[in-house]
Every structure is written in C-alpha cells, then in structure tokens.
Amino acid sequence: HNTTVFQGVAGQSLQVSCPYDSMKHWGRRKAWCRQLGEKGPCQRVVSTHNLWLLSFLRRWNGSTAITDDTLGGTLTITLRNLQPHDAGLYQCQSLHGSEADTLRKVLVEVLADPLDHRDAGDLWFPGESESFEDAHVEHSISRSLLEGEIPFPPTS
C-alpha cells in the first residue's frame, strides 16, 4: 500500500478520507488504527457501528470520530483539536471476523498554528530529506510521502 499524507493544523480538525470498493467490502465494519512502530501492531483507535447497516452513524473515541458511507465507499475519520502527539502513521481497515484488510495507510502531519506563537519545536512531521518508500500525492490538506521519506521520527 502507498502511504497518503494528511496535514492538519494544531488545534483544528483534520478529516481523513479512505476510499474503497463498496461491493468488495460490503457488510464489513471498518476501523481506524494507529501503527505502533514501523513493524509493530496497529492499535485500534475507533471502529464503525457494531451493526453494519448503521455504519453511517458517527462514532467517537475521545477526539477521533469515524463514519462510513457504505454505498459510496468512503470511510471518513475526523481528528478533532489536532495535537502534536496525533502525528504518526495510521491505517483505515476493513474488518472481517478477526481479520483486518488495510484500505489505506495514512501519515498524519501536525503543522504549527500560524496564529499560535508558542514554541513549535515539539511539532513533528517528516522532512523532505528523510526517507520512506511508496508514495503518491493526494491533498486535503494532504499529500503522499515523497520517495525516501520515513513515517516515523528518528529515534536516538
């Protein structure tokens, strides 16, 4: 899977969209999870309604909401009051029994609020010189990772 970058401004809301084949994933609940490390597990953040027919109803877990347009084939995740610690790699998933298919890999970047003059040193997003593979561009504010960029900040 390519990784799509979605950029949001700290303190504001960010909407992430994950398109999918509505027929292929018919009847399947969806989930939004956070990747723990480059090769680690994907930790569930929020999932759609337990009854697939009610997937259009927005479900919240803390400041993260999920809703699914099952006919149109678009899963939408909203991250409200975006914070620096929200930056990182996520996945949109289609659930089937105990299995999960990845619909899209998403890198969330948190940008400093231009109206906020506090120190933005703790805001992280990958620099142009960092490396990661498989990228294509999509805006919302979003883009895809440039070739050679990495989705996780370097660890010392």
């Epitope: 027929m23 009847g27 609940r29």
Partner: antibody
Framework: EVQLVQSGAEVKKPGESLKISCKGS????????IGWVRQMPGKGLEWMGI????????TYSPSFQGQVTISADKSISTAYLQWSSLKASDTAMYYC??????????????WGQGTMVTVSS | EIVMTQSPATLSVSPGERATLSCRAS??????LAWYQQKPGQAPRLLIY???TRATGIPARFSGSGSGTEFTLTISSLQSEDFAVYYC?????????FGGGTKVEIK
C-alpha cells in the same frame, strides 16, 4: 438469469497441469466474490479459497495454499482454478460458487454445476 | 481455523415428521452461518444464511436458529424431496469452513 457455468469433466495423469473455469452471467461479475469448493468422492464439502474478480484479491484455505492457484479474468467474467502438477488425491468434484453479500459474512447463493477432475495413471 | 461439527451424521426420519439438525462451531461465529442442501449428483443449494434467514425460494418448513457456537436447522414436516445431505458453513472467518454433513434418510 444469474448463473455460473463450469468447464467440462477432465481426465488427467499425475504430474500434468490443469486449469478449469467458471463463467458468470446475469450479474456484475466483478462485484461479487467467487469461491471454490472441493468434494472428494463420497465425502463432504471443503472450502478452498475465494477471489474478488474486481481486483483479483485472493484468499486461500491453508489446506490448499500452494497446492492450487485461483485467478480471474474480469474481461470475460471467468474465474479459474489451476494445478501445476496434479496428484491422484486431487480426484474430486470442484464447484465454484458466488458469495452473497450479507450484513456481515458471505454465503454461497449461486453454484456452478461442478467439474469432475479425475487423476489416474 | 474454525472447526464445524455436525450431528448426527445420519438422521432417519419418516415423511411428515420433524427433523432437527445441529451444528457446533469451535469458536464463536456470531450469526455468520449458512445451511446448504445437497442431493446426489447435484450441486449444493443455499437454504439459510445469517443463521436464520431463508434464501430466496426456500419453503417455510426450513428454519434456522442459533448464534455464537450452537446452531440448529429444523425441517418442520419432511417432504420426500427433503431427503438429502445438509451442510452448515461458517462465513465469519477465513478460511470459511463446512461441517461434515448430516444425511437425512427415510425411516
């Protein structure tokens, strides 16, 4: 009429290759999963694997992984089951079936007539 | 892999009587269970899906119940055309698996 029509019976020798087909009609072939089921003589049904012709996403049962290949050609609404080297134990009736999309899960609502494969030296 | 166990292996019933077939899953499959009927020389036919919903064209004498790990197919009054082999199948988790089948024969 919604139907799946399978290719005819085959008699093969051990070690030979084989590709049997399942052609769908009367519905949007690319929008439904297609499964393959084996039934050995006098035995029950065994789920082999499933494919989504829209993008050829395929899942195999561990029992059949590496033993067979499931594929599809959406341009001619046909799914395939193939062997590169047949064994006598592959002798069975093979069914393709369309997966009915449910609120959660998929049951096989339309079945092909079956293809009898006989492998004997 | 989820193991599906059907009982009894053979059920002898007189026409007009009630037949009760059981299917047990080795772990919960929620309500994702289907029942099929197969007659000699024919392909299987879907009877019940979602544990209790009758497929199109299936007579009302066929009913399914259960959820989780225990399921039942009931044929309220057996007709001559109902004597066949019945299979349950879970479609909750890959690989989807079938039970070994129950043969319903004339007593």
């Amino acid at each position: 009429e919604v139907q799946l029509v399978q290719s005819g019976a085959e008699v093969k020798k051990p070690g030979e290759s084989l590709k049997i087909s399942c052609k769908g009609s009367g519905y949007s072939f690319t929008s439904y999963w297609i499964g393959w089921v084996r039934q050995m003589p006098g035995k029950g049904l065994e789920w082999m694997g499933i494919i989504y012709p829209g993008d050829s996403d395929t899942t195999y049962s561990p029992s059949f992984q590496g033993q067979v290949t499931i594929s599809a050609d959406k341009s001619i609404s046909t799914a395939y089951l193939q062997w590169s080297s047949l064994k006598a134990s592959d002798t069975a009736m093979y069914y393709c079936a369309r997966a009915k999309m449910l609120d959660d899960g998929y049951a096989f609502d339309i079945w092909g007539q079956g293809t009898m494969v006989t492998v004997s030296s | 892999e989820i193991v599906m166990t059907q009982s009894p292996a053979t059920l002898s019933v007189s026409p007009g009587e009630r037949a009760t077939l059981s299917c047990r899953a080795s772990q919960s499959v929620s309500s994702n269970l289907a029942w099929y009927q197969q007659k000699p020389g024919q392909a299987p036919r879907l009877l019940i899906y979602g544990a209790s919903t009758r497929a199109t064209g299936i007579p009302a004498r066929f009913s399914g119940s259960g959820s989780g790990t225990e399921f039942t197919l009931t044929i309220s009054s057996l007709q001559s055309e109902d004597f066949a082999v019945y299979y349950c199948q879970q479609d909750d988790n890959y690989p989807y698996t079938f039970g070994g089948g129950t043969k319903v024969e004339i007593k």
